[in-house]
């Protein structure tokens, strides 16, 4: 902390300019007027400050504003929002989408610190649920933001957020993530017709149950395997052979390469060996003809 | 980066000196570049400096209107004219360079520094 000292003789700052950085740290402190500082903070950004004499104008700051800074100085920050700890960062009260996108950009670039990631708490928690405009915001900084979330954060996300999540957003999503986002995007999406539904749902099939697969298979949607692989493996197994030959399309073929790995190994030994053969991949593992299968889950569920 | 001063001596009191401030193997762009000096005993204090955005020049009061500061950005140099030189102007004077490095602050670099003795 810098030493209280009186302000020499001509010093004394009438505004906040570029002169200030030629100040020593005890000048700055005894010079510069903390709410002549708050009124100028926008001024701060142009100015190239040393990590030390920036020290001193938070210093200032705080003491002006002990039970926190109101947003109006919030949103000038610039450079010094990089100073704050996420325990400043708890005080405040931001409610501007712009204040937010004015401090996401000072840290363009970089992982998301301890002190965005406190900032974007306390602005959701104050928004009360992620609203597109937010997450639209928040994905064009962090693309990996959503996935990032808990499901029961996840969960406050309201299907008309989902217009905003590009394909590369979900990237890191787990399963469980999905199993969350995927009914709020079929949500979302159910008023777009079939292709450009496939399109859009894509990226969030990871979450879809047996059904919604079954549906897509009668609807000629050409499913890459990329996207197959990271389907739920609970989900593709009930899928029969004619079934996933519909939901692929031209893309069958790729299931040879991936016969080794869930789902499709898990999936092809389910599967009548007679009925893989149809699709005349090679594909080995299946049921041999002439066995029984029992389905013991339909079994435990009518006992 | 490396500043190099030059152009101190000893000098008679009302007497001028020009000192000269070269600086080398620049990273980032420089914001401002000035003179502060030293005296036995005494803190360091800034003496005048130049930014070279709007060519604007600072000095300490104890200075103003005897020294003189300019300099040329895209030489990377920086001179201080000082003319009626007082016994009180004796110290060594250091060069600084303030380079712009936002979004995350500012560096401060500074010479070797050249002894001005006026008698």
């Known amino acids: 902390e810098v030493e209280k000292t009186a302000c020499p003789s001509g010093k004394k700052a009438r505004e906040i300019d570029e002169s200030l950085i030629f100040y020593k740290k005890w000048e700055l402190e005894a010079c510069v007027d903390a709410a002549l500082l708050a009124t100028q903070m926008d001024r701060v950004n142009a100015i190239p400050f040393t990590y030390e004499q920036l020290d001193v104008l938070k210093h200032k700051l705080d003491e002006l504003y002990p039970q926190g800074y109101p947003e109006s100085v919030i949103q000038h920050l610039g450079y010094l929002f990089l100073k704050m700890s996420p325990e400043d960062i708890r005080k405040w009260n931001v409610t501007s989408l712009e204040t937010l996108k004015a401090l996401l950009e000072v840290n363009k670039g970089h992982e998301m610190s301890p002190q965005v990631a406190t900032l974007i708490d306390r602005f959701v928690k104050g928004r009360g649920q992620l609203d597109k405009d937010t997450l639209d915001t928040l994905t064009a900084f962090y693309p990996g933001y959503l996935c990032s979330l808990s499901p029961e954060e996840l969960s406050s996300v309201p299907p008309s957020s989902i217009w905003a999540v590009r394909p590369q957003d979900l990237d890191t999503c787990d399963p469980r993530q999905l199993d969350v986002l995927y009914p709020k995007a079929r949500l979302a999406f159910q008023n777009m017709n079939g292709s450009e539904y496939f399109v859009k749902i894509q990226s969030f099939l990871g979450g879809a149950p047996t059904e919604d697969l079954k549906a897509l298979s009668q609807q000629n949607v050409s499913m890459d395997l990329a996207t197959f692989m990271k389907l739920r493996t609970d989900a593709v197994l009930p899928l029969t052979v004619a079934e996933v030959q519909k939901l692929l399309g031209p893309h069958v073929e790729g299931l040879k390469a991936e016969e080794r790995h869930r789902p499709v190994r898990d999936w092809i030994l389910r599967q009548r060996q007679d009925d893989l053969d149809t699709l005349g991949l090679g594909l080995q593992g299946g049921i041999p003809n002439g066995y029984l299968v029992l389905d013991l889950s339909m079994q435990e569920a009518l006992s | 980066v490396q500043l190099v001063e030059s152009g101190g001596g000893l000098v008679q009191a009302g007497g001028s000196l020009r000192l000269s401030c070269a600086a080398s193997?620049?990273?980032?762009?420089?914001?401002?570049m000035g003179w502060f000096r030293q005296s036995p005993g005494k803190e360091r204090e800034f003496v005048a400096a130049?930014?070279?955005?709007?060519?604007?020049?600072y000095y300490a009061d104890s200075v103003k209107g005897r020294f003189t500061i300019s300099g040329d950005n895209a030489k990377n140099t920086v001179y201080l004219q000082m003319n009626s030189l007082k016994p009180e102007d004796t110290a060594v004077y250091i060069c600084?360079?303030?380079?712009?490095?936002?979004?995350?602050?500012?560096?401060?670099?500074w010479g070797q520094g050249t002894s001005v003795t006026v008698s």
């Open positions: 130049i930014s070279w955005s709007g060519g604007n020049t």
């Open positions: 193997g620049r990273t980032f762009s420089s914001y401002a």
């Open positions: 600084n360079e303030r380079t712009t490095v936002l979004p995350t602050g500012a560096m401060d670099y």
